[in-house]
């Protein structure tokens, strides 16, 4: 697994370097998670032909994965810093149950899956410190999450492979949109 941000050897060797700003730390954290997702996607794609799945087939799912929309204020047109930040944090909180699901889905990248999950928790904490309007952030219901997790784990193997592929793809897209938006803040 790649070294988490703030723990790389270069930081230790260069004590006189300026400490990272909050925005830089968030940027670095997202890029670190994206690297982890790339590694997980590589294993998924090598294992099966899921990555060739058509967009139509992937669209026919009943997963409620977070997705950026125009109204969220994260796109260049209609950009709204506060609304967008709330959306990013809420979305990441909603992704957590899916990241938990991924934990037993990888054979050779088990540590990588754990690193993505833990790094996302850290990212949420960073972003919550940045947000002014924490009251607007809705936390997913633990009971609903528990039953969703049970349901996902009960699926047949093909559906679990497809679900894994879709979660990784959607999470990557969400983080890329978040990264672009956060760079405007």
């Amino acid at each position: 697994a790649p070294v988490p941000p703030g723990e790389d050897s270069k930081d230790v060797a260069a004590p006189h370097r300026q400490p990272l700003t909050s925005s830089e730390r968030i940027d670095k954290q997202i890029r670190y998670i994206l690297d982890g997702i790339s590694a997980l996607r590589k294993e998924t794609c090598n294992k099966s032909n899921m990555c060739e799945s058509s967009k139509e087939a992937l669209a026919e799912n009943n997963l409620n994965l977070p997705k950026m929309a125009e109204k969220d204020g994260c796109f260049q047109s209609g950009f709204n810093e506060e609304t967008c930040l709330v959306k990013i944090i809420t979305g990441l909180l909603e992704f957590e149950v899916y990241l938990e699901y991924l934990q037993n889905r990888f054979e050779s990248s088990e540590e990588q899956a754990r690193a993505v999950q833990m790094s996302t928790k850290v990212l949420i904490q960073f972003l919550q410190k940045k947000a002014k309007n924490l009251d607007a952030i809705t936390t997913p219901d633990p009971t609903t999450n528990a039953s969703l997790l049970t349901k996902l784990q009960a699926q047949n193997q093909w559906l679990q492979d497809m679900t894994t592929h879709l979660i990784l793809r959607s999470f990557k897209e969400f983080l890329q949109s978040s990264l672009r938006a956060l760079r405007q803040m």
Epitope: E60, N62, N156, Q157, L159
Partner: antibody
């Protein structure tokens, strides 16, 4: 051709245990999940559980927890099911069935193992 | 668990006619464009024989007179034209998730 060959019929006494086998051929044994299904005489079908031979991960129907134990042996491409503390309620035909994969691979069933519990 | 309700419980059809068996699921058995509904034929003393998998695909060696259709929660098995050899028990089964569940069965006889 995918084939599942199950062990022969068993006549066992109440309270005893029985272990039946399901030998797989024609495919990579560790790449597919193996399910077990029960059918009592003249009745419907009931799912017992499954084993993933890749990592020996198992999942059981609540009703069969403590009754059935699923294991597998990669070297011989064989799945096993052991039934313990047998009663007349356990008299049935037991099937192993390999799970398919999407619309590319269909499920495949064994011929069944008949278990009769009688004193 | 997904409950499968099969109807009718028994059916008598004349040779050459059409037999239709229905199976309704308590929730959708679809996922990513595939319906995980299977149909089996079982004769006394024999193991279940897979006729149709993923709603409409024919099992190997299954005659074309066996047709499966449906998606979501509603499925049907059509046999046309009915032949002598088709007299048996028929079961629907969902393999979308565990526990695998089965319909109560339909006893099909020759009228």
């Amino acid at each position: 051709e995918v084939q599942l060959q199950q062990s022969g019929p068993e006549l066992v006494k109440p309270g005893a245990s029985v272990k039946m086998s399901c030998k797989a051929s024609g495919y990579t044994f560790t790449s597919y999940v193996m399910h077990w299904v029960k059918q009592k005489p003249g009745q419907g079908l009931e799912w017992i559980g499954y084993i993933n031979p890749y990592n020996d991960g198992t999942k059981y129907n609540e009703k069969f927890k403590g009754k059935a134990t699923l294991t597998s042996d990669k070297s011989s491409s064989t799945a096993y099911m052991e039934l313990s503390s047998l009663t007349s309620e356990d008299s049935a035909v037991y099937y192993c069935a390999r799970e398919g994969y999407g619309n590319l691979e269909r499920d495949c069933w064994g011929q069944g193992t008949s278990v009769t519990v009688s004193s | 668990d997904i409950v499968l309700t099969q109807s009718p419980a028994s059916l008598a059809v004349s040779l050459g006619q059409r037999a239709t068996i229905s199976c309704r699921a308590s929730e959708s058995v679809d996922g990513f464009g595939i319906s995980f509904m299977n149909w089996f034929q079982q004769k006394p003393g024999q193991p279940p024989k897979l006729l149709i998998y993923v709603a409409s695909n024919q099992g190997s060696g299954v005659p074309a007179r066996f047709r499966g259709r449906g998606r979501g929660t509603r499925f049907s098995l059509n046999i046309h034209p009915m032949e002598e050899d088709d007299s048996a028990m028929y079961f629907c089964q969902q393999s979308k998730e565990v526990p695998w569940t089965f319909g109560g069965g339909t006893k099909l006889e020759i009228k």
